[in-house]
């Protein structure tokens, strides 16, 4: 056929996989009669008749291409649709008339890949090895044509190296005629690889220009021997008693090896192993001054038996230890004098404080308090406290409590309680002195004592209202070996208009309990009630 | 220095009376309870009864109400047992001792040794 | 009124040995954080010597070796290292109440 030795290159179609190829034939008015065109698909140089036009009228053949084949443009341009990878071939139209002329056109078939998987060498690496290990391969699956990989570590790309990197790929036609493509990357690794990061990158064009997508980063288990061992206490800084602390052995080889934790034994000098939990912590809690010591670690290479030793570290657990005032129980005569001194040992220096137990006022800044002219009103607890000003919340504290000889002083002299005829009243009355007072009672009734504090003590007394009792009052008396004292509780019938808003009728009117500094208590109504005082 | 001396001791025959003393030296007497507690030959101690010199209140251990009587002389610093109707089982070392208002003693004398037999 | 019962009521040791001595109170001897209970030493022939008061608190001039600790009904005296000059009957005694009462006393012998 004459012209057929210099053949112009076909026209190139680029197209996505699944979507629709435009194949316009390209033949001339000169060259053919575009109402009268035979389409053809040449795959190892040998052409099939896919479809023929005739008037303008297209028909497809019968075969692969029969569904997917239809003419646009007016008979110009013959559309292939889904599009896949077996359709990349040479396909060509040729006119009838005047004479026979053909026009080809090459269709370019592409196909994205997946996202590249990259799965890591889960055995991970020993940087002694020979030759180049596995270290982790890449999949980038359904791509058309191959993609191209390359590797990376720490963001530089890598190169074929002897005996150092070597990158083996493979791919596989899957049934569809998409490419999956598997590369392997090998290398000698060595211990600052521990760290590396990796990953592949896949380069593939598009009708649109060339892409690429890249995996995730991966590390690289790498396996090295261990150099040196070491520990660490957490938290850093002062340790105080009462505080969670952690002793942990660590080492700079991987896989580490098998710790244990010793304490020095202060008496013998020898290294006596400690009880850690199951990640091989020393966990100290609550921390004890005894805790304090020379520790160190000791790892051992299971596979080498190589033992190596820690450098050993002090701990120090720092505390303060039981306060200690003296006298312990103090005892003195109105008018007298009084020291109270605080001892305490600690790891560090102490601060000493004196406060008042009741009011927390601070007396003094020191461990000695001295107390002149002792008043009954000087009684109570007074409490030091011998803290670490370095370490804040390291404190002991000690109370002590004062006890002034004196008869009983009563929490009020005499006091209003209004009651109804016939009703259970539940009369207190509370009474403080060194010794402790005992409180008796002028009326029958039931009465319970309760010790309030080495000094001071309450009476409470179940009495019923009659007209006698209402005549006479109650008295309560105080006494110890030093005196007594009384208290009167007059005894009022209410009626409607002494009643005050918030009273109850009912509960209101059974309970009146008689206690120093409260002179209104919530379930009784009382009037004009005096200060507490004492009968002394 | 704080001390507290028993006295008048001895052998007495069943029935009769005898009357301690215990001075008291380096202390406020007054300011002080003092007590007597006993111990017969291998046994154990047993309290007997208390004073309070500043106002003479006395305390005694149900077992000798009416049988004994604590006393003091503060003019002297002295305290007394004055005991009546001794029995055999009374036979005991007698000690005074010195306490404050939580009632634990604090300063003892030495004894003095009371044998009840005829 | 209120029984003390001390145990052991005799016991052998060795010179600094640990020592531990109870009291049991038939009821409690503690009152709003003091517990009312003493321990006294008595040697052949000499007075009983106030060791400890108030539970816990060390008498003036009594080595620090002896200790005590306790609350409500039961108490210990500990020895925490003896000494030859210890070997001694001990007695604990309350003060809660009227009448005042020891415990029998522990003979502490050497073993």
């Known amino acids: 056929v004459p012209g057929e030795a210099e053949q112009p290159a076909p026209e190139l179609v680029e197209v996505e996989v699944g979507s629709t190829a435009l194949l316009k034939c390209g033949l001339s008015q000169s060259q053919g009669n575009l109402s009268h065109v035979d389409w053809f698909s040449v795959h190892k140089e040998k052409r099939t008749l896919i479809f023929r036009v005739r008037q303008g009228q297209g028909q497809s053949e019968p075969g692969e291409y029969e569904q997917r084949l239809s003419l646009q443009d007016r008979g110009a341009t013959l559309a292939l649709t889904q599009v896949t990878p077996q359709d990349e071939r040479i396909f060509l139209c040729q006119g009838k008339r005047p004479r026979s002329q053909e026009y080809r056109i090459q269709l370019r078939v592409y196909k994205a890949p997946e996202e590249p998987n990259i799965q890591v060498n889960p055995l991970g690496i020993p940087v002694n090895s020979k030759e180049p290990e596995e270290v982790a391969t890449c999949v980038g699956r359904n791509g058309y044509p191959i993609p191209q990989v390359i590797w990376y570590k720490n963001g530089r790309p890598l190169k074929e190296e002897k005996n150092r990197v070597h990158i083996q790929s493979s791919q596989t036609v899957e049934s569809s005629g998409l490419y999956t493509l598997q590369s392997i990357l090998k290398a000698q690794l060595v211990k600052e690889d521990k760290d590396a990061q990796f990953y592949c990158e896949l380069n593939y064009r598009l009708p649109s220009g060339n892409h690429m997508k890249e995996s995730r980063e991966v590390t690289v288990p790498v396996f090295y021997p261990t150099e040196k061992v070491w520990l660490e206490v957490e938290p850093v800084g002062m340790l105080k008693e009462g505080d969670r602390v952690e002793i942990r052995c660590l080492a700079d080889g991987n896989p580490p090896p098998h710790f244990s934790i010793s304490k020095q034994n202060p008496s013998t000098r020898e290294a006596e192993e400690e009880t850690t939990n199951d990640n091989g912590v020393l966990v100290l809690e609550p921390a004890r001054k005894e805790h304090s010591g020379r520790y160190e670690c000791q790892g051992l290479d299971l596979d080498t038996m190589i033992s190596l030793l820690s450098e050993p570290q002090e701990l120090l657990v720092n505390y303060v230890s039981d306060v200690r005032v003296s006298p312990a129980a103090p005892e003195r005569q109105e008018g007298s004098s009084l020291t109270l001194t605080c001892e305490a040992e600690s790891s560090q220096d102490l601060e000493f404080q004196w406060l008042r137990e009741e009011t927390g006022q601070v007396l003094e800044r020191g461990p000695v308090l001295q107390l002149h002219d002792l008043k009954r009103e000087a009684g109570g607890g007074y409490r030091c406290v011998a803290s670490v000003p370095s370490i804040p919340g390291l404190n002991r504290t000690q109370l002590v409590n004062v006890a002034i000889f004196g008869p009983p002083w009563m929490a009020f002299k005499e006091r209003k309680v209004w009651v109804k005829e016939n009703m259970v009243l539940n009369l207190s009355c509370e009474a403080s002195g060194h010794p402790r007072p005992t409180i008796s009672w002028n009326v029958n009734g039931t009465a319970s004592e309760q010790d309030q504090d080495p000094q001071r003590v309450l009476s409470t007394l179940n009495v019923l209202v009659t007209p006698e009792l209402l005549e006479t009052g109650v008295e309560c008396t105080a006494s110890n070996d030093l005196g007594k004292n009384t208290s009167i509780l007059f005894l009022e019938l209410v009626n409607l208009t002494t009643l005050t808003p918030d009273s109850n009728t009912t509960t209101g009117l059974s309970t009146s309990t008689a206690s120093p500094h409260t002179r209104a208590n919530s379930t009784s109504t009382e009037r004009k009630l005096p200060e507490p005082e004492s009968r002394g | 220095q704080v001390q507290l001396v028993e006295s008048g001791g001895g052998v007495v025959q069943p029935g009769r009376s005898l009357r301690l003393s215990c001075a008291a030296s380096g202390f406020t007497f007054s300011n002080y309870w003092i007590h007597w507690v006993r111990q017969a030959p291998g046994k154990g101690l047993e309290w007997v009864a208390r004073?309070?010199?500043?106002?003479?209140?006395?305390y005694y251990n149900e077992k000798f109400k009416g049988r004994f009587t604590i006393s003091r002389d503060n003019s002297k610093n002295t305290l007394y047992l004055q005991m009546n109707s001794l029995r055999a089982e009374d036979t005991a070392v007698y000690y005074c001792?010195?306490?404050?208002?939580?009632?634990?003693?604090?300063?003892w004398g030495a004894g003095t040794m009371v044998t009840v037999s005829s | 009124e209120l029984v003390m019962t001390q145990s052991p009521s005799s016991l052998s040791a060795s010179v600094g040995d640990r020592v531990t001595i109870t009291c049991r109170a038939s009821k409690s001897v503690s009152i709003s954080g003091y517990s009312y209970m003493h321990w006294y030493q008595q040697k052949p022939g000499k007075a009983p010597k106030l060791l400890i008061y108030?539970?816990?608190n060390l008498e003036s001039g009594v080595p620090a070796r002896f200790s005590g600790s306790g609350s409500g009904t039961d108490f210990t005296l500990t020895i925490s290292s003896l000494q030859p000059e210890d070997f001694a009957t001990y007695y604990c005694?309350?003060?809660?109440?009227?009448?005042?009462?020891f415990g029998q006393g522990t003979k502490l012998e050497i073993k």
């Open positions: 001792a010195r306490s404050g208002g939580y009632w634990y003693f604090d300063v």
């Open positions: 108030l539970a816990s």
């Open positions: 004073i309070y010199p500043g106002t003479d209140i006395t």
């Open positions: 005694q309350h003060s809660r109440e009227l009448p005042y009462t």
